[in-house]
């Protein structure tokens, strides 16, 4: 059947998800397309312990989430709801800056390298996580 | 032995439709995206479609967008590629490829003609 | 759409020479680059990916080297083998695009 019962290999298996860490950069939106190449997304953070999680795996280096406001409200890749969900942004973040001279403000989200969250320019070629969840149907204990 | 056998190539004429098939053995197929890539006579290299392992995300070149629908048979480790209203500029050899995590292309198939004649 | 320049579109060599061939990409792709080889009537062999990771089975006479827009496939001493066409490949960004190839032919 197409039920995900374990994690692809070089995927890392956490509380029912699995995670693919890259080691290179892409621009968010191509981030996100190789995360939907492999039938993930990016990485959507619903708690402190998934958060502390991914810090650990990603050490101090700025790393794409799937949180954006590229349409206006920040939106997680998954349909989770941001208003009520988990947080962890920087002091004064998000702040939309435009002083970097690229064009435009700051769209979409990243772990920076203490693992607080930061908007920045959605070109910028940062690496990124990409999350997929295991079937809830394999999570069912085997009949005996 | 890692393997990609193309099929369901010929002539066929402008506007027709031709459905391409590619036979995956040697690996665990549904576990890779896979993709489409084409090369008019005496040309260069044009890349056409890629669709995930699972089958559920697929991207297009424009050139081929809303003509051609790339998708998969997990169960029977083929890949397809239907190709609509056909035209001349169409005339190539399709290879089909395997995709790697570095999102290049490790292994290909040994390709199949679609000419686009009247 | 990001563009792959390719440098020259052929060259000519004898065996033991040492062939490079150059390929810009229009934008910045960091190392999301690829080598391909041709023969006539056959299928493309991939020989380099993210711009220097050589592939398993490739002799180590082929290397590949570069990143942001510039990059570069060196042959250090053609064989008889070589005598191809060569293609790059950006997989940075949909599309991904191939250089037009560069023929390596016989001196």
């Known amino acids: 059947g197409s039920e995900r019962t374990c994690c692809p290999v070089n995927w890392v298996e956490h509380e029912r998800s699995c995670y693919w860490f890259s080691r290179s950069g892409k621009a968010w939106a191509d981030a996100d397309n190789y995360c939907r190449l492999e039938d993930a997304h990016l990485v959507v953070v619903t708690s402190w312990e998934e958060q502390k999680f991914v810090q650990h795996h990603i050490g101090p280096v700025n790393t794409w989430m799937g949180l954006h406001d590229q349409n206006g409200p920040w939106k997680w890749v998954d349909g989770t709801d941001y208003e009520t969900g988990f947080k962890n942004w920087r002091p004064e973040q998000p702040d939309d800056w435009y002083g970097h001279g690229l064009g435009g403000g700051e769209d979409c989200a990243h772990f920076t390298d203490d693992g607080r969250w930061n908007d920045d320019v959605c070109q910028r070629p940062y690496r990124w996580v990409c999350e997929t969840e295991l079937d809830k149907a394999s999570q069912e204990p085997p009949l005996l | 032995e890692v393997q990609l056998l193309e099929s369901g190539g010929g002539l066929v004429q402008p506007g027709g439709s031709l459905r391409l098939s590619c036979a995956a053995s040697g690996f665990t197929f549904s576990s890779y995206a896979m993709s489409w890539v084409r090369q008019a006579p005496g040309k260069g290299l044009e890349w056409v479609s890629v669709?995930?392992?699972?089958?559920?995300?697929?991207f297009y070149a424009d050139s081929v967008k809303g003509r051609f629908t790339i998708s998969r048979d997990n169960s029977k480790n083929t890949l397809y590629l239907q190709m609509n209203s056909l035209r001349a500029e169409d005339t190539a050899v399709y290879y089909c490829?395997?995709?790697?995590?570095?999102?290049?292309?490790?292994?290909w198939g040994q390709g199949t003609m679609v000419t686009v004649s009247s | 759409d990001i563009q792959m320049t390719q440098s020259p579109s052929s060259v000519y060599a004898s065996v033991g020479d040492r062939v490079t061939i150059t390929c810009r990409a229009s934008?910045?792709?960091?190392?999301?680059l690829a080598w391909y080889q041709q023969k006539p009537g056959k299928a493309p062999k991939l020989l380099i990916y993210?711009?220097?990771s050589l592939q398993s089975g490739v002799p180590s006479r082929f290397s590949g080297s570069g990143s942001g827009t510039d990059f570069i496939l060196t042959i250090t001493s053609v064989q008889p083998d070589d005598f191809a066409t060569y293609y790059c490949?950006?997989?940075?960004?949909?599309?991904?695009?191939f250089g037009h190839g560069t023929k390596v032919d016989i001196k």
């Open positions: 490829a395997k995709r790697t995590g570095d999102d290049v292309f490790d292994i």
């Open positions: 934008q910045d792709i960091t190392s999301w």
């Open positions: 490949q950006q997989v940075n960004s949909f599309p991904f695009t």
């Open positions: 669709i995930s392992g699972r089958g559920g995300t697929t």
């Open positions: 993210a711009a220097s």
